[in-house]
Amino acid sequence: EVEKTACPSGKKAREIDESLIFYKKWELEACVDAALLATQMDRVNAIPFTYEQLDVLKHKLDELYPQGYPESVIQHLGYLFLKMSPEDIRKWNVTSLETLKALLEVNKGHEMSPQVATLIDRFVKGRGQLDKDTLDTLTAFYPGYLCSLSPEELSSVPPSSIWAVRPQDLDTCDPRQLDVLYPKARLAFQNMNGSEYFVKIQSFLGGAPTEDLKALSQQNVSMDLATFMKLRTDAVLPLTVAEVQKLLGPHVEGLKAEERHRPVRDWILRQRQDDLDTLGLGLQG
């Protein structure tokens, strides 16, 4: 019997192709040259290797690149990416957005794994900031990505990147995160006219201060109740009844349904009853 450390005669791999799926694990170890594997990584993903076989291929790459894989290999990892640990990924230097996209594609449709989180972290740190193209890519794959960042991390987002943010990307952001994002959005959209500006800024208003809400109330924006309910309580409290009426426009009637919930409840308690009565909604201060 052939010793399991030696490649059987005639089985030395000349190229990475589908014949290798018939190799036992020890044959892959013995018969596939790591340098050949590295140069033909683009073929691996098209070959239905078992996960045990992929373990062998990963081991070969680990031996060839103990300090971390080069980007030429990383870009073509495909399913092999799922075999990588966060520790493996921390050794990488990923600079190409194409590489990032290729690896995110492997994990598409599933929650962000520790591997993906580490990959993104390495990529963003390598770039120094969350530029628009990166943010575009990340929020396309993970709509909740932005809200997974700390306020400190969000501070590195340049205002120009805000154009890539869609309303659903902010669904799970808390007020501290919106506090950071709102001024960036205000800066990004500052040259837009009134109605267009409101459409863009609306999702970020959970971070808006009182003076900006007062300014919006002068622009006939007709803010919906869902947006109003996400405003900072401390920003809403100083608004007058007239300002809230102008801010909400026809949606002002919705205050009645929300009178027991913050920030509406707290705002009502701050108003004079005579002023509340002008709304004709039966609100009791």
């Epitope: 239905p48 799922l82 994990n107 598409k108 599933h110």
Partner: nanobody, 118 residues
Framework: QVQLQESGGGLVQPGGSLRLSCAAS????????MGWYRQPPGNERELIAI???????VYRDTVKGRFTIRRDNAKNMVYLQMNNLKSEDTGVYYC????????????WGQGTQVTVSS
């Protein structure tokens, strides 16, 4: 995941033919790889043939030209047509399903015995 059940095994003379069938309990249309393995007496299980989602077959060298894998996604069936059988084809044949990527899984059938002997 799907459950798999093989049938069609039996005793056949060298040079004869058999067709193995594998019935899946659920849809196989989105399963990346369907395949057949065999376990010769006293040896480990080895891959014989696979069919990807489009039905393209890939074969072990020793069965090329003699065996044909066919995948019928509409009927959730996989077949292995075995012609010109040899004594070394003797073994238990297993149907196998494998999903690639995230949420991957593999399923095995119970196996069906094929004996090639005169």
């Amino acid at each position: 995941q799907v459950q798999l059940q093989e049938s069609g095994g039996g005793l056949v003379q060298p040079g004869g033919s058999l067709r193995l069938s594998c019935a899946a309990s659920g849809s196989i249309s989105k399963i990346a790889i369907m395949g057949w393995y065999r376990q010769p007496p006293g040896n480990e299980r080895e891959l014989i043939a696979i069919a990807n989602m489009t039905g393209t077959g890939v074969y072990r060298d020793t069965v090329k030209g003699r065996f044909t894998i066919r995948r019928d996604n509409a009927k959730n069936m996989v077949y292995l047509q075995m012609n010109n059988l040899k004594s070394e084809d003797t073994g238990v044949y297993y149907c196998h399903a494998r999903q690639l990527g995230v949420g991957s899984f593999e399923s095995w059938g119970q196996g069906t015995q094929v004996t090639v002997s005169s």
